[in-house]
Each structure stands twice: as C-alpha cells, then as structure tokens.
C-alpha cells in the first residue's frame, strides 16, 4: 500500500502536488509498511480494542487562517479515557483516587512502555532496531528521551505526509509559501506502540485556510458606552479603534504596516502607522467604517526581465516594478500589487487586509460631575447615620437612572449600592440623597445612565461625627 491509500480520500491534482511542495514533507506515493503499522477502515471492529478502557480522541487545531508565506502551526492533543493520563516517563497511568466504570484499578499502569521497550528491543547496540521506524521505514530520530515518546503521528495534506514521534501532544509548523490559496484539509492518523509493532488509536481531520489577505480584526471601545459589543456608540466622545492582525508566526514583524481608515462621516482618508486610533463622530446616525491594512511582506519575485538583445546594454540586476496606491473613490483593495526584484531573490509584495463595519451613533451621557455636597440636618437626632445630598450635573442626553456605590476609602470593598429612576429636566441638574452609617471616609461612585450610556464620577468624602459644628469634607474628587 501507498501512503495515499492509507491516509486520505482527498487526491490532489498533479498540478497541486507539484506546486504545493512542503519543505521537509514527503510524497504520499511512498510505500506504507502495513506489517508494522496495520491499516483499519472506519467501522473496523478492531478499533474497539485499540486502547484499554475506551477510545482515545485526537483533537486537531491550527492557528489558521495563515497569510501566504507565513507559518501555520497544527497541534494534536490526545484525550484519554476517564482516569487515564500520561506520566513523566511517557507511560499511561491511572490517576490516583479516580473512579471509572471499572472502579479503582490495582495496576497503576494502563500501558507501561518503559518495561516493554526494555524487554523487547533486541537492539544492535546503536539504539536502533528494525521496529523503531516510521511507516515509510525512516528510523526514529534519537534525541534525548525519545524512548518516552510512544505515539506516532502521521500528518497528511496536499498529497504529502510528515511523520512525527511524540507524547500525548504534538505541534507541527508548515510554511505556506507554496500552498495554494483557499481552504485545505489536514488529516492526522495516530498510532501507539504495541510491543514490536504499532496500533492505530485515532484519526482526525481539520480544514485550514491559506489567504493572501491579511486577517484583520478591530475592537472598539468608548468611555460611557453601555454595551461595547453592539456597535452602537455615543456622539461627541472618542471611540478607540484597535486593530489586531492575526499573525501568530510573526511573519509581518519586520513589515511597515499602514492603516488606512475611512470613518464614513466626511473625514476622508485617515492614514496611520499606529494600530490604535481615536475617532469622534459629531453626527447621529449610521456610518460605514472601512479599514485597509497594507503591509510589505516577503513574497514571490516577479519573473526575471527578458534577456537583452545583443545590440542593447545589459540592464541592471536590480529591477523594480512599482505601482502606487490609488486614492480615487473606489472599492477598497483594488490597488495593484507592488513587487520589487532584488538580486538575492529576497522580494517583497504588498499584502492587504480589509475590515468593514456599520456603526450607529446616538446621543448619550457624556459627562457627570458632583458640584456640591450638603449634610442634611435630620429632625430626629440619629446618632449613627448621616444624610448627604449630592448635587449632580451632566452633559449630553438626559439620564433615566442614578446609582450610587458607597465603598471603603480604597474604593474596593462595596458597602452598599442604591439605584433609582430619575426624572431630570433639560438642564440636567439633580440632587441625590444618600445615607451614611457612621463617621469616616467613604468612596462614592455615582453613575448616571440611560439606554445606551453610563457615565461615572467618583469622590472621596469625610463624614464627621454627629457634631453639628463639624463640616462635611470632600476629601478629593
């Protein structure tokens, strides 16, 4: 049998096989050693007994999407049946005091591979034996502690395979420079040691994506905005936009990145080299936000210039093909690629990423201030508590509720919270009365809210003993 017979039903075309050469991977036309690595079809009854105590599940993840040319990393994690784990020696043991269907096990080992390998290696002194090989016959790499690695992982994609010896978790990185754009399938088959042979224990597949567009995400934050995830923000307050570029392999680390913003509110094009930008909308309504991210990334070189005619002088080796960004009104991302040819084939290509959002701008409470605090004299002497009136002003829309949170002087330990609806006039001037139990210093957080906004002000106040002569003090605001 060949690798492709064993590993995959997806058969890439000859073109795909030729143009998607992965560095360090081998062609799936190679022969598979079925004696050492038996092949079971899906539904084969032998799967039931491939692992003591149940089935092993393999979980395959990747940090896809990957910008073409960058590295994509695949991780496989094995999930063992309940109460089983891998120990420091790579053996599979029962967890202490863990009860599964079979109850507590007397034998601490599910698989004691250390003992097996000592018993059955029959090696030739080099540490190498005929069964310490991968399915294609290549010997296991002998780095320190390799004996504790008892799982064999075979990765398969784009008509090629990669073999790896590992523990219950492995990672493989692939450079995507030669990978066709779009979704691709990665399949992994996992075997475990079984004496002098191997037994399949799990198969898993996952789709990954290679793209020529920079994967871009934007987070938006605004002070006083009640719900930051609904893309509704407040007029006349800055919104902070933070651009996150998905680049887990740091492919763009040395690239100059430009962020070209169109906020959709007649502010034209705003270009920045900073991934964060603040923008204030001064109108209510719905606006279309567009971001184009541009990065000069390592990329393919253009074809070499045609050989010169004999009568002409030889052109310089360093030829530059450049086309400049267009700023004409038009769809974002219609800029031609920029290529530069330099002698060592170390060329750059402009890559673009795009983000679009529709954001809604509404009126909101922009600011709240405590302008006065008054100790209210109570008709009945009340030795333990003080009534205090806070006179509060606000800017922006009219609040519908007020909350006060009274806490210790560090503002960390809440003592009580009171919220109540308010009816405020256009001037936005209101009085909030609150009770303080006993003298001392208190932190007061006062918030005014409506449907879309929540504005906060804080102050430290000193409540004196119930001596009419002692004044109320605002410690600081």
């Amino acid at each position: 049998k060949r690798f492709h017979d064993v590993l995959g039903n997806e058969r890439p075309s000859a073109y795909m096989r030729e143009h998607n050469q992965l560095n360090g991977w081998s062609s799936d036309e190679n022969d598979w050693n079925e004696k050492l690595y038996p092949v079971w079809k899906r539904g084969d009854m032998r799967w039931k007994n491939s692992w003591k105590g149940g089935r092993v599940q393999a979980v395959l993840t990747s940090d896809s999407p990957a910008l073409v040319g960058s590295n994509i990393t695949f991780a496989v994690n094995l999930i063992f049946p309940r109460c089983q784990k891998e120990d420091a020696n790579g053996n599979i043991v029962y967890e202490k005091n863990c009860r599964n269907e079979a109850g507590l096990s007397a034998d601490p080992y599910v698989y004691n591979w250390t003992a097996w390998s000592e018993d059955s290696d029959g090696e030739n002194g080099t540490g190498q034996s005929h069964h310490n090989v991968f399915p294609d016959g290549k010997p296991f790499p002998h780095h320190p502690g390799w004996r504790r690695w008892n799982f064999i992982y075979v990765f398969h994609t784009l008509g090629q395979y990669f073999q790896k010896l590992g523990r219950c978790s492995v990672r493989v990185s692939v450079n995507t420079a030669n990978v066709t754009l779009g979704p691709q399938l990665m399949e992994v088959t996992v075997y475990r040691r079984h004496g002098r042979a191997y037994v399949p224990i799990a198969q898993v597949k996952d789709v990954y994506v290679v793209t020529d567009q920079i994967p871009v995400f934007v987070t938006m934050f605004q002070k006083n905005d009640r719900n930051s995830s609904d893309e509704t923000f407040l007029k006349d307050l800055p919104i902070m936009f933070d651009v996150l570029i998905h680049d887990p392999s740091h492919f763009l680390n040395y690239s100059t990145i430009n962020y070209k913003w169109s906020f959709g509110d007649n502010t034209g094009l705003f270009v920045s080299t900073n991934h964060t930008v603040n923008h204030t909308y001064v109108l209510n309504g719905t606006f279309s936000l567009n971001l184009t991210v541009k990065a000069a990334a390592p990329g393919p070189c253009p074809p070499p210039p045609p050989p010169p005619r004999p009568s002409k002088p030889t052109p310089s080796l360093a030829t530059t093909l450049k086309s400049y960004d267009s700023n004409t009104p038009g769809p974002a991302g219609d800029n031609p690629l920029e290529l530069s040819r330099i002698p060592d084939e170390n060329c750059q290509i402009n890559r673009y990423g795009h983000f679009q959002a529709t954001i809604t701008i509404v009126e909101g409470i922009l600011e709240v201030n405590i302008i006065q605090m008054t100790d209210v004299l109570m008709p009945v002497p009340w030795p333990e508590s003080s009534l205090i009136d806070f006179v509060v002003t606000c800017q922006g829309s009219i609040p519908t509720e007020v909350c006060t949170i009274i806490s210790d002087p560090t503002c960390e330990i809440t003592q009580n919270t009171v919220c109540s609806p308010v009816d405020v006039d256009e001037m936005c001037l209101l009085t909030v009365r609150r009770t303080f139990n006993g003298s001392g210093t208190y932190c007061v957080n006062l918030t005014l809210g409506d449907d879309t906004s929540l504005a906060l002000t804080s102050t430290l106040i000193s409540v004196p003993d119930r001596d009419p002569a002692s004044p109320l003090r605002m410690a600081n605001s």
Epitope: D265, N266, T267, G268, L269, F270, V271, S272, V277, N278, T280, Y281, V282, L283, G285, T286, N327, T328, P329, G330
Partner: antibody, heavy 112, light 107 residues
C-alpha cells in the same frame, strides 16, 4: 474618471433664492459625502456644509445654517445647494467637492 | 469649531528654493490635515491628506508633516508652476474648516 460638473453662472436679485447643482460621474454619488465651499473674490475658502447622498445626513457650518439647504438625488447622481434670502454678501464662486475632487465652481452674482 | 490658522498670507520664493508653509489648529486634530493648491482661475486641488500622505499623481517635491496642532507643508524645489495659494484644511470631524491661505509668489 471622477468628475463633478456644476451648473452655470447665476445672476439674481437680492431677496431671491437660487438652486445650483453638481452632477457626479465616474463613481456612485451615494458612496461619498458631497461638500459645498464658498469663495468670495480674492478671499479664502469657507466650508458651507456637507450631505451624505446615501441617507441624506447633513452637517452645516453654523454660519450657513439658515442660508443654505443641501439635497441630493441619487437617481440622477446630482447634489444640490439652495441659497435663500440672497444679499450681495452671497456673491461668490461656490464649489462642490468630494474627497479629492472639486467641481469647476458656479459663480453667483447678486445685484439689484 | 476648530480654527485653522495660516500665519503667513504671502510668501516669496525663487525657483529651486525650498519653502515651508505652516498651519496651526486651535485644538488637537491628530494627523487629520489636508493641503490644497489653488491656481488663479481654477478650483483647488488636493495635494496632501492625513498630514503627510501625497494624493494620487502629486509630485514628490510636495511633502507634509506634523501632528496634534502644528503642521507644515513643504515644497523641496519650487517650480514656476507652483505659483498658487495653498490652503490647509482639517478633516478631523465631519465639519471641515480651512486655513486662510498662503499665497506663494515667485520672485
């Protein structure tokens, strides 16, 4: 290519109104805000206001709030500015402009 | 409203000289400043946006710099065709304002 074609020169009397137009070609009118700018002879540029033709949002320079009214007709790709209660102070060249593009200007003369 | 102030109404220069025109905003406008060129009898033309980015087709002798409240527009080697009035404009909010303009005269 993008072009903004403005209506011809206007000669009118004080107290009347005038409506000038700006026809966009080479792009979709509703994609970009249309701005209007005033320039009196020998003077600088004064921003009057702007309209988003896709939803008719408008914003004005407070100085022109009661003087100018901006409208747009997506079907004909045309933006309009109406100036009312004209005085000699309104005599000027009026430009329409979108991001990076300017019309050739409409000259308004108000004279009795 | 944001006020844009160009301190020099006129600047005199010679062909081949380097000349810089300044503009000050009454409040922080980040880098949201554009520069326009207006030649006699013509509409203005956008040269620079976002403080330092040349608009399509603008020769590279025109550059811009600055952020916050202070901005500079520079012509590295003045040509006769650069005789014009140069206006700064903020595009920080929906409501634009222009500077008063600086007229560049060729000696």
């Amino acid at each position: 290519q993008v072009q903004l074609q403005q209506s011809g020169a206007e000669l009118t009397k004080p107290g009347t109104s005038v409506k000038m137009s700006c026809k966009a070609s080479g792009y979709t009118l509703s994609s970009y805000w249309m701005n209007w700018i005033k320039q009196r002879p020998g003077q600088g540029l004064e921003w009057i206001g702007t309209i988003n033709p896709s939803n008719n949002y408008t914003a004005y320079n407070l100085k022109f709030k009661d003087k100018a009214m901006l409208t747009a007709d997506k079907s004909s790709s045309t933006a309009y500015m109406q100036l009312s209660s004209l005085t000699s102070e309104d005599s000027a060249v009026y430009y329409c402009a979108t991001w990076g593009y300017w019309g050739q200007g409409t000259t308004l003369t108000v004279s009795s | 409203d944001i006020v844009m102030t160009q301190s020099h109404k006129f600047m005199s220069t010679s062909v081949g000289d380097r000349v810089s025109i300044t503009c000050k905003a009454s409040q922080d406008v980040s880098t949201a400043v554009a520069w326009h060129q207006q030649k006699p009898g013509q509409p203005p033309k956008l040269l620079i946006y976002s403080a330092s980015y040349r608009y399509t087709g603008v020769p590279d002798r025109f550059t811009g710099s600055g952020s916050g409240t202070d901005f500079t527009f520079t012509i590295s080697s003045v040509q006769t065709e650069d005789l014009a009035i140069y206006y700064c404009q903020h595009h920080y909010t929906t409501t634009w304002t222009f500077g008063g303009g600086t007229k560049l005269e060729i000696r």
